[in-house]
Amino acid sequence: MQKGDQNPQIAAHVISEASSKTTSVLQWAEKGYYTMSNNLVTLENGKQLTVKRQGLYYIYAQVTFCSNREASSQAPFIASLCLKSPGRFERILLRAANTHSSAKPCGQQSIHLGGVFELQPGASVFVNVTDPSQVSHGTGFTSFGLLKL
Amino acid sequence: MQKGDQNPQIAAHVISEASSKTTSVLQWAEKGYYTMSNNLVTLENGKQLTVKRQGLYYIYAQVTFCSNREASSQAPFIASLCLKSPGRFERILLRAANTHSSAKPCGQQSIHLGGVFELQPGASVFVNVTDPSQVSHGTGFTSFGLLKL
Amino acid sequence: MQKGDQNPQIAAHVISEASSKTTSVLQWAEKGYYTMSNNLVTLENGKQLTVKRQGLYYIYAQVTFCSNREASSQAPFIASLCLKSPGRFERILLRAANTHSSAKPCGQQSIHLGGVFELQPGASVFVNVTDPSQVSHGTGFTSFGLLKL
């Protein structure tokens, strides 16, 4: 997209990782068929993609989950793409919601989020879900990435 | 995205085509409001997008389907974005799953897949679904494409 | 993506706006964490993104809605990404459909649309839904954007 040393391509695609942590922030890994173009984007602490250069980025996430209406809370399953920039408040960039399935033991559903956002140097993006234990980690089901325009 | 003869834009967007074939690989056509930037990306055999240049590509697919829980297998409807390259293993890049609807005769649902991946020269990407007969081919419902960063 | 005065980046991301209008065309605003790269793309009448330059664009929309099967029509909820070019017929570029939920009072679902399309100078893209009153306007739930390759 950007050619030469001045404008190297900046892109990442990371793969979901099951986690024993109780946090609602999803965990990711550079495994399988992942992408990490160079050190201008990095995966930090297995949970956030951090960029070194300011600019416009297309950021996306896909989350597949399996839930059941009776076993889950009344509230829907929500996936949120969030932004943390140095010295700024955390922001929700995108959200998607799916009501739980009535299928037993659980019904699978997939959510896709994506949009163009201005990121500052050192900005980090991460994905929050209402219940990480419901997320599907089979090959290709849940992933997270970005590309610099 | 890439300018000049050295870096021509490479992009494609193809439209779903109903098929009498029993294969799980979806069929596509250059029809309707399709995109085929140049011969550096081609639609082969109506089923796969093949690229001539190595690089990072944002690849996406959207599949709308209509299914009913009682009439379908227990397993969910799964759409998979797959990659094959000369001399390499076939790989699943992305998958999405949706449990069948209880609506009668069937309930429509849409799946969107997308991510950034490294493709080798001659690499082909294609879309697999669990039941092609359930796919909706009305205008705009099911499509497949890519763009080179 | 495009560097220098000859090739400025062209990108937009706008946020849904609740509307008292009965039209099926969704309304958008430059509010929250929106993107509007420059005047080569503009939001017109709060409903359409209009581009000044011909070229290939990745266009996307995300719509979250809350509906109930009993309270809604038999037909599914459909979101359509449409194109209007000067002197040309209106076209549907992409559509997605989701059957209404049986959850009470309503069940939330999210739709994501995205694809690469050739736009002419002065072309406008907009989003239609079957029932705008069902659309969720909470932070991040419903958005619309594009980027020029």
Partner: antibody, heavy 116, light 111 residues
Framework: QVQLVESGGGLVKPGGSLRLSCAAS????????MYWIRQAPGKGLEWVST????????YSPDSVKGRFTISRDNAKNSLYLQMNSLRAEDTAVYYC?????????WGQGTLVTVSS | DIVMTQSPDSLAVSLGERATINCKAS??????????MHWYQQKPGQPPKLLIY???NLESGVPDRFSGSGSGTDFTLTISSLQAEDVAVYYC?????????FGGGTKVEIK
């Protein structure tokens, strides 16, 4: 079962041309990348060309680039190698092959002799 | 181009004994966790036969006395107990990068 049968080899003068064919059966031909590999008498193996399932992507090493053209006709389940400007060093048995990631299926080969 | 160096050029082993052939690539042939190195057996007047694909995967129908190992640049084909029918020339090949290249071959004989 999978079968690959090459034909079209023979004796040709330097600078001449020859077209090799490979008839495929026992599999869905259009689903597979196909390859030509050659072996000079008493020597090792050399990869000659690759073609994608639909025939839109082809690749050949510098040793034959611009002289050899790989093509296919999926309706006829056939793979071809058009060889122009032949040289003495092109003398070899030419094999067509299929497989990912290793070449699991080979034909018996056809001998091409380039000599004046 | 990736240069494949096979060693030894020839090998004489007693029946029932272990035979080991090495192949060194001039650069890594690993890609996303897979090693794109393959081994073939060729007998006089026959086309090559795939034995091992992607470093260590035994091709269907190949006896399990054949095994492959290695990653990166260094790979090994092992015949655990040489049989008379194993007399042949063995080639390694990489499909990691165009142009695909083969090793020069190792001739295996009975001692």
């Amino acid at each position: 079962q999978v079968q690959l049968v090459e034909s079209g080899g023979g004796l040709v003068k330097p600078g001449g041309s020859l077209r090799l064919s490979c008839a495929a059966s026992g599999f869905t031909f259009s689903d597979y990348y196909m390859y030509w590999i050659r072996q000079a008498p008493g020597k090792g193996l050399e990869w000659v060309s690759t073609i994608s399932g639909g025939g839109t992507y082809t690749y050949s090493p510098d040793s034959v680039k611009g002289r050899f053209t790989i093509s296919r006709d999926n309706a006829k389940n056939s793979l071809y190698l058009q060889m122009n400007s032949l040289r003495a060093e092109d003398t070899a048995v030419y094999y067509c092959a299929r497989g990912e990631p290793g070449l699991a299926y080979w034909g018996q080969g056809t001998l091409v002799t380039v000599s004046s | 181009d990736i240069v494949m160096t096979q060693s030894p050029d020839s090998l004489a082993v007693s029946l029932g004994e272990r035979a080991t052939i090495n192949c060194k690539a001039s650069q890594s042939v690993d890609y996303y966790g897979d090693s794109y190195m393959h081994w073939y057996q060729q007998k006089p007047g026959q086309p090559p036969k795939l034995l091992i694909y992607a470093s260590s995967n035994l091709e269907s129908g190949v006896p399990d006395r054949f095994s492959g190992s290695g990653s990166g640049t260094d790979f090994t084909l092992t015949i655990s107990s040489l049989q008379a029918e194993d007399v042949a020339v063995y080639y390694c090949q990489q499909s990691h990068e165009d142009p695909w290249t083969f090793g020069g071959g190792t001739k295996v004989e009975i001692k």
